[in-house]
Structures are given as structure tokens and as C-alpha cells.
């Protein structure tokens, strides 16, 4: 009981990061900086704490990095817009969990998050947001990697 | 999965020409950098343009390429290079390639080549 | 615009050796660095990339290392066939670092 089910095609959510990638990622000018690849925190996570560090970063990409970013191209804001509705959908998902009191958050996994968005915070705000989509993948292969996903029809 | 240049040959100082990148085993509908890469003789290698064959089209260009260089793509298998005012320092080999830059690095693809000569 | 660096210009070893070659970048890049070996009439061909992680079918003879500014390729246990030249470039994904991303090259001849 403690991994809630994400009930959200996690394969389309890939697709879409695919194809809008390399244009968010070649605006990206800080090699140095990282906000969440290679990031050790979300490597050694405990099983117990998959839930809330999920709804955690879901919360990170909806409320900043979405919202910090300004795209204009519309090709590329109609998939992020994709992503976006579906990250609402999944923290939807989560709410169900919390309900059933199974998305505790311990401090390990709070100070996971605090680092997160401390590492948003060093770079100027559009800087941030390109950085942080450009490393959704590492979001992305986490879920895979820490919840049972179950494919919706 | 291969690419194969086009388009190469002896053209005379000042003359334009465009080069054809080709794909085969793959194709450009999806999202790829497909970029041109250029070596003098006996010298090397030049970054010259990239394209993303994606959604978003984005083009990027050396800045001593701006202005004389296009690259586009122009069917889901053809990305082109057209040049123009071109001078003997043109001479070159080009190379098209997939994904240099990025991290799908690992699976990046280069075409054999073809050579521009620039001459009167 | 980031400038890459590669020294020496050219380097001698004999078969069964060790060759070193140094790429340095004008500002930190991260791990973001490849090499490549190039043949007369060939495109180049990725030996390593993210500075040390060895591409598809490439020997561990070659061995890359280093991050920031500073990149070393090592090819040990020389063969006939390692005789090219090799480049250094920064593959970082943002695309303000693409201009003059490779070395100049360096020649290796096996003797």
C-alpha cells in the first residue's frame, strides 16, 4: 500500500518531452548547474517516501517551472501544455492517496524537495524554468522507476 | 540508419550551391539536431548549422555562417544547406550529422561527406 | 563562445605505447565533451562522450577523463590501426556553446 498507482500514460508524457527536448534544452546556458539530474536526493529515496516526493515535484513543475516558463512557440506550448494537464491529472491521483493517508511526508523527503527548489532559486527565474524542463526526463525516468504505472485506456 | 550528403562538386567563386543530407533507416518526423559540420583540407573540423527536425523547427548557425548559410528541412528524410557568395576558403568536405550536440551524443550519426570545391 | 583547446599538435608512439592528449576549454562545460577518431576519407567517428563514458564498440583501451575546463584522452596499449587524428568537442546541450566546439585536432603516428 505504500506506492500509490499513477494512472497516467506515462509513455505519451515521454513522447512529448521527446519532441520538445533538444529545443528547450539548446537554451539552456549554464553547464555547471544542475536543479535535478545526477541529483543523489532523489537517487536514494526511500520507498516510503515515493509518494510524497512525487506529489512534492508535481507541485514544483505545476506551480513554478510551468508557470516560470514563457513560451512562444505554440507548437512547442501546445506539448507543454500536454505535459502540464498531465501532471494536474497525476497530482489528482496522488490527492486520492493523501485521502487514504498513504502519502506521508517525512523530513528526508522534505529536505528531497527543499534542495530542488533551492537549486531553482540560484538562477534568474526563465533561466530556472528552461533548466528544469530540460531535465523533466530525470523527473520522468524516476516515476517509471518508483511507481507501478498503470496504462490508461 | 545512415546519412548520405549530396550536392557537392566544383562550383565558381561567388556561385551558390545546396547540399541535400539524406536519411535512410530513420526519418525526420521525429525530433533530431541534424547538423552541418565542415573540414578544409588538411584541416579541421568547423560547426556550421544545425536544424531540430521536431516540432519547434529551431535553426542555429555559427556566426560566421549567419547570413550566407540557410539549413532547413525540407521532406521527413531531406534537410538541406544552401550556400551562396562562396570564396576559395569554402573548399571543404561537408558532413551532416545526427545529434552531436546533447545528450543523445551516444547515439549520433555522421554521413560519409561531400566535397565543395570553390574555383575559377 | 566557448574555444576548445587541444594540445599537442602532433604526437610519435610506438605500437604496444601510450598516448595522452590534452583538450582544454575556455570556460567550464560540465562533462560535456566528446572525442572522436578520424581516418583520411572517413567522417569522424565518437570514441567518448560526457567526458569519460566510452561510445558503442570502442575498446577500454581508450579512456577519457577530466570535467570543467580540463579533458585528457588516453589511448593505451597502441595498434597500427589507433594512427589518426582525434578531436575533442563540447556536445553541451545549449546550443550558445556550439560555435568552435571542437579542438583543432591532434595527429597520433604509431611507429
Known amino acids: 500500500l505504500r506506492r500509490c498507482l499513477i494512472s497516467t500514460d506515462m509513455h505519451h508524457i515521454e513522447e512529448s518531452f521527446q519532441e520538445i527536448k533538444r529545443a528547450i534544452q539548446a537554451k539552456d546556458t549554464f553547464p555547471n548547474v544542475t536543479i535535478l539530474s545526477t541529483l543523489e536526493t532523489l537517487q536514494i529515496i526511500k520507498p516510503l517516501d515515493v509518494c510524497c516526493v512525487t506529489k512534492n515535484l508535481l507541485a514544483f513543475y505545476v506551480d513554478r517551472v510551468f508557470k516560470d516558463h514563457q513560451e512562444p512557440n505554440p507548437k512547442i506550448l501546445r506539448k507543454i501544455s500536454s505535459i502540464a494537464n498531465s501532471f494536474l491529472y497525476m497530482q489528482k491521483t496522488l490527492r486520492q492517496c493523501q485521502e487514504q493517508r498513504q502519502c506521508h511526508c517525512r523530513q528526508e523527503a522534505t529536505n528531497a524537495t527543499r534542495v530542488i527548489h533551492d537549486n531553482y532559486d540560484q538562477l534568474e527565474v526563465h533561466a530556472a524554468a528552461i533548466k528544469s524542463l530540460g531535465e523533466l526526463d530525470v523527473f520522468l525516468a524516476w516515476i517509471n522507476k518508483n511507481h507501478e504505472v498503470m496504462f490508461s485506456a | 540508419q545512415q546519412l548520405e550528403e549530396s550536392g557537392g562538386g566544383l562550383v565558381q567563386p561567388e556561385g551558390s550551391l545546396t547540399l541535400t543530407c539524406t536519411a535512410s533507416g530513420f526519418s525526420f518526423s521525429s525530433s533530431y539536431w541534424i547538423c552541418w559540420v565542415r573540414q578544409a583540407p588538411g584541416k579541421g573540423l568547423e560547426w556550421l548549422a544545425c536544424?531540430?527536425?521536431?516540432?519547434?523547427?529551431?535553426t542555429y548557425y555559427a556566426n560566421w555562417a549567419k547570413g550566407r548559410f540557410t539549413i532547413s528541412k525540407t521532406s521527413s528524410t531531406t534537410v538541406t544547406l544552401q550556400m551562396t557568395s562562396l570564396t576559395a576558403a569554402d573548399t571543404a568536405t561537408y558532413f551532416c550529422a545526427r545529434d552531436i550536440f546533447g545528450s543523445a551524443i551516444d547515439n549520433s550519426l555522421w554521413g560519409p561527406g561531400t566535397l565543395v570545391t570553390v574555383s575559377s | 563562445d566557448v574555444v576548445m583547446t587541444q594540445t599537442p599538435a602532433s604526437v610519435e608512439a610506438a605500437v604496444g605505447g601510450t598516448v595522452t592528449i590534452k583538450c582544454q576549454a575556455s570556460?567550464?562545460?560540465?562533462?560535456?565533451l566528446a572525442w572522436y577518431q578520424q581516418k583520411p576519407g572517413q567522417p569522424p567517428k565518437l570514441l567518448i562522450y560526457?567526458?569519460?563514458k566510452l561510445a558503442s564498440g570502442v575498446p577500454s583501451r581508450f579512456k577519457g577523463s577530466g570535467s570543467g575546463t580540463q579533458f585528457t584522452l588516453t589511448i593505451s596499449d597502441l595498434e597500427c590501426a589507433d594512427a589518426a587524428t582525434y578531436y575533442c568537442?563540447?556536445?553541451?546541450?545549449?546550443?550558445?556553446?556550439?560555435?568552435?566546439?571542437f579542438g583543432g585536432g591532434t595527429e597520433v603516428v604509431v611507429k
Open positions: 568537442q563540447c556536445h553541451y546541450h545549449g546550443s550558445s556553446y556550439w560555435d568552435n566546439s
Open positions: 570556460e567550464s562545460i560540465g562533462n560535456a
Open positions: 536544424i531540430d527536425t521536431g516540432v519547434s523547427g529551431d
Open positions: 560526457d567526458a569519460s
